[in-house]
């Protein structure tokens, strides 16, 4: 299936050029998306090209600037947030990145009624997190690991927590492992729907072992970065959830929400919090052995001023074939009765589908079904449920948006996006206004991305929000590679792959092959999305064929494929890449002597193991920031898939699945090992141990480190990295510079 239109007129060929590495590094062909910042059923805010904050009313068609670029510039604001009562805007500046989601910033409050910044009782700096209440203009913020509340922006703050301590106690913000592996947010506090209550998590990291690494900087002595980071089997953070009444917070104080008894009996995690009403909250908990999850619905008892979580409102989700959920345990979407909810979990056939839970999970009503998966529930209204799935035409790497009418019986299903721009758009996400009155569709490809606005009742397209015209024009004289998404059937396993082919691809010729792999549990690489990136350049300019393969352990194709890797990471993911390579060779256009593999993070682990598989298939390969032993990686992630590194659990496979154990097998391949020294996620330790094992085995290899760079290798390091990898591959494939 050719997803990119091929050129028709040969006369065009002369004026067209291949992609260059510079194009990629400069982001010349990057695209834009448009996500409305919804503030009501029919209004949204958007930051214009000249940095004004503009309010759009869909129904009147009017728009006006609520905050000028002059005001933004006066405090060097890079972000903003309008209070729900529309009286104030917070302006965010001095952004300073911490980990994947977290950052600190300076905040200024601007009063829209008088056009002045709020003076007196200004916010401290830097703030770790700040947000408005959902109604009115109360502010909650986290400063130095403690939570503060302002009843009004000009008021003095009320301190809610007092025990916050750097690297020890975190209130309202997650510690490293919860941020990266559980919540995937920079915050751990949640307002109730009308702002009456504020729930927050407290993470106690006192007993967690600390990872320490040098940050070289510019000083005479490097400084040491210390992060409480639980590796597999280590002591974990202790989490507690509290709720405080924000009307009179100084009276009762924070009230702890009880943990379900079956969860509290051993090590556990808190996984998410969902407010249902102002006086009903839903908490999700997970055993440390992550195959049992409990959803607990708690009610406020006015007379006791406590939160009551009756056993009758505990819903257990258990997996017998793997871990609970997909990457994370799914979160519930409550219906209007404030007790029943919709949730995605595995059906009896092992496919993730939407279920409706009214009383017990056992009595759940299955809403979607089939040999495909429901991926996200966007919105539930009185009469409709909007969700995304990969059902359409049986392509797991697509995403379409569906509407199920839940107001009528039997419920009817309609694909909202399947036939809108069928060739251009096969991978969508959506953003809904209040009550789903309107929604934006963001199409990511396979054609050039486009964002559109739609009527929530009729699904009619109202207008194009962003169509990337400039990008379209810029690409007109570029020889883009061709892309195809197909599948291989091998031993009852379906291996979907994406192949990126040189523009003048000729099946009768032989091409060098580069496998790009990630392969982590519940990931998906073969997606129908648009991208002009490094591998596009390698195909366009350097004439390589690039392939991405989704093997066992990957997502959205059922539990059989997903949970195949349970407790044995590093086996089937590698086998399936090798199997695919053999099949590609059989296709006849791959030069068997010029096959390489590369990957980053989990992909670096898989590429390393593939290179050390002893198959003789790969001439060379690259591992960027690889995991080398699961004992070195974070507890929450690792144990989800591998269990514990103890004798009576899974220590044996922890030991067997290291890259170091296969050091001897690197002798006959060219290996490039790359890592940032300040990687907070996959620690440099991983590559240091690979290097040590290779040296001890007297195996030659190439390596590059990036001083003071984290897992993302950003900034100038990115340019250096891709230039370096390009040289390595061209040398490996005997391509002239």
């Amino acid at each position: 299936i050719v997803l990119r239109p091929s050129r028709v007129h040969n006369s065009e060929e002369n004026t067209m050029r291949a992609l260059t590495l510079k194009d990629i590094l400069n982001g010349t062909f990057s695209y834009k998306t448009f996500f409305p910042n919804w503030i009501s059923g029919q209004e949204y805010l958007h930051q214009s090209a000249d940095n004004n904050i503009v309010l759009y009313n869909i129904e009147t068609g009017q728009s006006y600037t609520i905050l000028s670029n002059r005001t933004m510039k006066s405090v060097n604001a890079s972000n903003y947030g309008l209070s729900p009562d529309r009286q104030f805007v917070y302006l965010e500046s001095d952004y300073s990145k911490l980990w994947r989601y977290s950052y600190t910033a300076t905040y200024y409050i601007y009063d829209l009624s008088n056009g002045e910044f709020v003076r007196g009782n200004e916010l401290p700096r830097p703030i770790q997190y700040l947000c408005w209440s959902p109604v009115g203009s109360k502010l909650a913020y986290v400063y130095q690991n403690n939570i503060y509340l302002k009843q009004r922006p000009g008021d003095p703050p009320f301190q809610i927590t007092f025990n916050g301590r750097e690297n020890k106690i975190f209130n309202g913000i997650p510690d490293w492992v919860y941020e990266e592996e559980m919540l995937a947010t920079k915050y751990a506090l949640w307002w109730s729907p009308n702002g009456k209550f504020l729930a927050y998590a407290e993470f106690n990291d006192t007993d967690i072992p600390v990872i320490a690494y040098s940050y070289y900087g510019d000083e005479q002595y490097p400084r040491t970065i210390n992060i409480p980071y639980p590796k597999a089997g280590a002591k974990n953070p202790v989490v507690r959830i509290f709720i405080i009444d924000t009307t009179y917070p100084a009276y009762v104080g924070p009230q702890e929400v009880p943990v379900p008894a079956m969860i509290a009996s051993s090590d556990y995690y808190f996984s998410w919090l969902t407010w249902v009403t102002d006086e009903r909250v839903c908490l999700q908990w997970l055993k440390r052995v992550q195959n049992v999850s409990v959803l607990s619905i708690c009610d406020f008892r006015e007379d006791w001023q406590t939160w009551d979580c009756p056993k009758t409102q505990e819903h257990i989700e258990e997996s017998r074939t793997g871990w609970a959920g997909g990457f994370f345990v799914s979160t519930p979407v409550f219906s209007y009765d404030a007790i029943s909810y919709y949730k995605i979990f595995s059906d009896k056939d092992g496919y993730k589908h939407i279920h409706y839970i009214k009383d017990t999970v056992e009595n759940a009503i299955q809403i979607t079904s089939g040999k495909w998966e429901a991926i996200n529930i966007f919105r539930v209204t009185q009469d409709s449920l909007f969700y995304s799935s990969n059902e359409f035409e049986e392509y797991p790497g697509r995403r379409n948006i569906y509407r199920i009418s839940i107001g009528s019986y039997p419920p009817s299903k309609k694909c909202v996006t399947c036939h809108l721009r069928k060739e251009r758009c096969q991978y969508y996400t959506a953003s809904f206004s209040d009550y789903a009155k309107y929604y934006a569709l963001v199409c990511y490809g396979p054609g050039i991305p486009i964002s559109t606005l739609h009527d929530g009742r009729t699904d009619q397209e109202i207008k194009i929000l962003e169509e990337n015209k400039e990008l379209e024009n810029a690409l007109k004289n570029i020889q883009l590679p061709k892309e195809e998404i197909k599948k291989l059937e091998v031993d009852e396993i379906t291996l979907w792959y994406k192949m990126i082919l040189p523009p003048q691809f000729d099946r009768s010729k032989k091409y060098p092959l580069l496998i790009q792999v990630y392969g982590g549990p519940c990931s998906q690489s073969v997606r129908s999305v648009f991208a002009v990136n490094w591998i596009s350049y390698l195909a366009s300019k350097e004439g390589m064929v690039i392939a991405l393969v989704d093997g066992r352990g990957t997502a959205f194709q059922g539990d059989k494929l997903l949970y195949a890797v349970y407790r044995k990471l590093g086996v089937y993911e590698v086998e399936d890449q090798i199997t695919a390579v053999r099949k590609f060779i059989e296709m006849g256009f791959i030069d068997e002597k010029r096959i390489a593999i590369w990957g980053w993070s989990y992909g670096g682990y898989v590429s390393s193991l593939a290179l050390a598989s002893g198959t003789g298939l790969f001439k060379c390969g690259i591992a960027v920031a690889p995991v080398s032993s699961w004992e070195y990686y974070a507890s929450v992630y690792t144990e989800r898939f591998m269990g514990l590194p103890t004798k009576d659990d899974n220590l044996e496979h922890y030991k067997n699945s290291t890259v170091m154990a296969r050091a001897e097998y690197f002798r006959n391949v060219d290996y490039l090992l790359i890592h940032g020294t300040a990687d907070d996620n996959v620690h440099f330790q991983n590559s240091a141990q690979i290097a040590k094992a290779l040296v001890n085995a007297q195996v030659d290899f190439q390596a590059m480190w990036y001083s003071d760079q984290n897992h993302g290798l950003s900034g100038l390091s990115t340019n250096h990295l891709y230039t370096h990898m390009t040289h390595f591959l061209k040398q490996c494939f005997s391509l002239s510079d």
């Epitope: 009782n121 009320f158 025990n163 100084a250 009762v252 702890e256 406590t306």
Partner: antibody, heavy 116, light 108 residues
């Protein structure tokens, strides 16, 4: 009806110790943060300490390290263990329902006199 | 810590008269965290007003509170014989919670 009844006050020498108790009834004791407030002739009303239903404690700087607040939810009782007592700790000690404000119910108070 | 200064120290009035008691904070206090108490000799303090202006349960409507920022007022619209007592303002906006030194309302 909410009732708070303090006991344990008395005369003690400087450097000595005393343990105050407050028996609570008429409300779900375990749910509420409770405080000790004192009234001394020289200082007026002064907040001393608080303890949440779950046992988290808070102290005024003037008593930190010397006084320990605790509670027994099964007995509906609040305690204040006072060590290294000083003359300036002389006051009527009230137990009150509430964290920082408001204190909506107060006991009758118990007198602590620190004198040699 | 926040210092609360009450004025006047003593207020001499007759029953039926209006009493206006002032409480000034050394720094801004959010009205949500300002309370007033009444104390009679030999008795425990009694909560009158919380949140600067909300009457506690069972408090007659002749008692009212107002103010914001650093200036707060307790007003007793018509003094009754049982209203003669010491009145304290209190803030809980910042730890430690602090009380004013009190205003004594006495019979003239």
């Amino acid at each position: 009806e909410v009732q708070l009844l303090e006991s344990g006050g008395g005369l003690v020498q400087p450097g000595g110790s005393l343990r105050l108790s407050c028996a609570a009834s008429g409300f779900t004791f375990s749910s509420y943060t409770m405080s000790w407030v004192r009234r001394s002739p020289g200082k007026g009303l002064e907040w001393v300490s608080a303890i949440s239903g779950g046992g988290r404690t808070y102290y005024a700087d003037s008593v930190k390290g010397r006084f320990t607040i605790s509670r027994d939810n099964s007995k509906n009782t609040l305690y204040l263990q006072m060590n290294s007592l000083r003359a300036e700790d002389t006051a009527v000690y009230y137990c009150a329902k509430g964290w920082f404000t408001p204190f909506d119910y107060w006991g009758q108070g118990t007198l602590v006199t620190v004198s040699s | 810590e926040i210092v609360l200064t009450q004025s006047p120290g003593t207020l001499s009035l007759s029953p039926g008269e209006r009493a206006t008691l002032s409480c000034r904070a050394s720094q801004s206090v959010s009205s949500s965290y300002l309370a007033w108490y009444q104390q009679k000799p030999g008795q425990a303090p009694r909560l009158l007003i919380y949140g600067a202006s909300s009457r506690a349960t069972g408090i007659p409507d002749r008692f009212s509170g107002s103010g914001s920022g650093t200036d707060f007022t307790l007003t007793i619209s018509r003094l009754e014989p049982e209203d003669f007592a010491v009145y304290y303002c209190q803030q809980g906006n910042q730890i430690p919670p602090t009380f004013g030194q009190g205003t004594k309302v006495e019979i003239k």
